[in-house]
Amino acid sequence: ARSEDRYRNPKGSACSRIWQSPRFIARKRGFTVKMHCYMNSASGNVSWLWKQEMDENPQQLKLEKGRMEESQNESLATLTIQGIRFEDNGIYFCQQKCNNTSEVYQGCGTELRVMGFSTLAQLKQRNTLKD
Amino acid sequence: LWMHKVPASLMVSLGEDAHFQCPHNSSNNANVTWWRVLHGNYTWPPEFLGPGEDPNGTLIIQNVNKSHGGIYVCRVQEGNESYQQSCGTYLRVRQPPPRPFLDMGEGTKNR
């Protein structure tokens, strides 16, 4: 397995642990969601990654100005996404790069599922069922 | 002891079986146990479900219903070492869409 596909809870550096919550979010399109990470903030800065599918490699999250916001209050880092869309579906990871070792550690990830009908075809299918 | 990442969620239709893997790099004598945390309920301790089924520590839940929803976490322990815990997989139980009232074969319709 690739190194990013495995993790452990080492007894090593203080930045080797990042706790992420929640594990899963399902919300309707247009809602606001928040995900959180708790870590030793003195060890290094936190960034956010995103991947659409389980088997993909996470990429650096491009924060959409005015809609996505990252904040940090000491040990607690928060990613807020407003007006969620279907293209926001995926798994979000917080990541910390250790100041002293340059090692990188990730949280477990938060899966976001945006609910609702994404295509006209899905909407038609639902109406057919109702009929 | 390494724990490999597991899917963040698993969607299973009502009445089907749910299979959870606990991938790790431990030797054969590792002790794998399964626990469930109710989603949004952070009470401790989580519900103990039992040991894993095979060398991979698989958990199988048969005939899934709505009450099975939650986060399923496995713990792996080697000897007296402290356990390692998986990130957990959220089980989503899907209600199959209702069959339309007039869902009948063409032959039936033409009778």
């Epitope: 809870n9 706790w19 959180h36 209050n73 040990s75 928060t78 | 952070y42 301790p45």
Partner: nanobody, 116 residues
Framework: DVQLQESGGGLVQPGGSLSLSCAAS????????RAWHRQAPGKQRELVAA???????MYADSVKGRFTISRDNAKTTVSLQMNSLKPEDTAVYYC??????????WGQGTQVTVSS
């Protein structure tokens, strides 16, 4: 509003022990992380130890093997057992609680002084 009440601080000689306790006026099912931070004079506040709802712990490198964090869910308390104390452990120690929704609460702080 959530209240956090710390206790157990004081003056102790190097090599001695102290136990800090923090009681939270919030149900344990509403807590994701409980932690202790500290702030020494002229320095930034830093994480000392934390424990989450899964029972996992994290410690600052400087206290590993000397400090132990624990919790009592029935009483919604979090404790910090500090052994082999050093003069550099002198600081104001703050209790910190975080809810699953990301709300963060802080205690008023309790002074720990390690001096001969």
């Amino acid at each position: 509003d959530v209240q956090l009440q710390e206790s157990g601080g004081g003056l102790v000689q190097p090599g001695g022990s102290l136990s800090l306790s923090c009681a939270a006026s919030i149900s344990s099912s509403s807590i994701w992380v409980r932690a202790w931070h500290r702030q020494a004079p002229g320095k930034q506040r830093e994480l000392v130890a934390a424990i989450n709802n899964d029972g996992q712990t994290m410690y600052a490198d400087s206290v590993k093997g000397r400090f132990t964090i624990s919790r009592d869910n029935a009483k919604t308390t979090v404790s910090l057992q500090m052994n082999s104390l050093k003069p550099e452990d002198t600081a104001v120690y703050y209790c910190n609680v975080v809810t699953p929704k990301g709300h963060q609460y802080w205690g008023q702080g309790t002074q720990v002084t390690v001096s001969s």
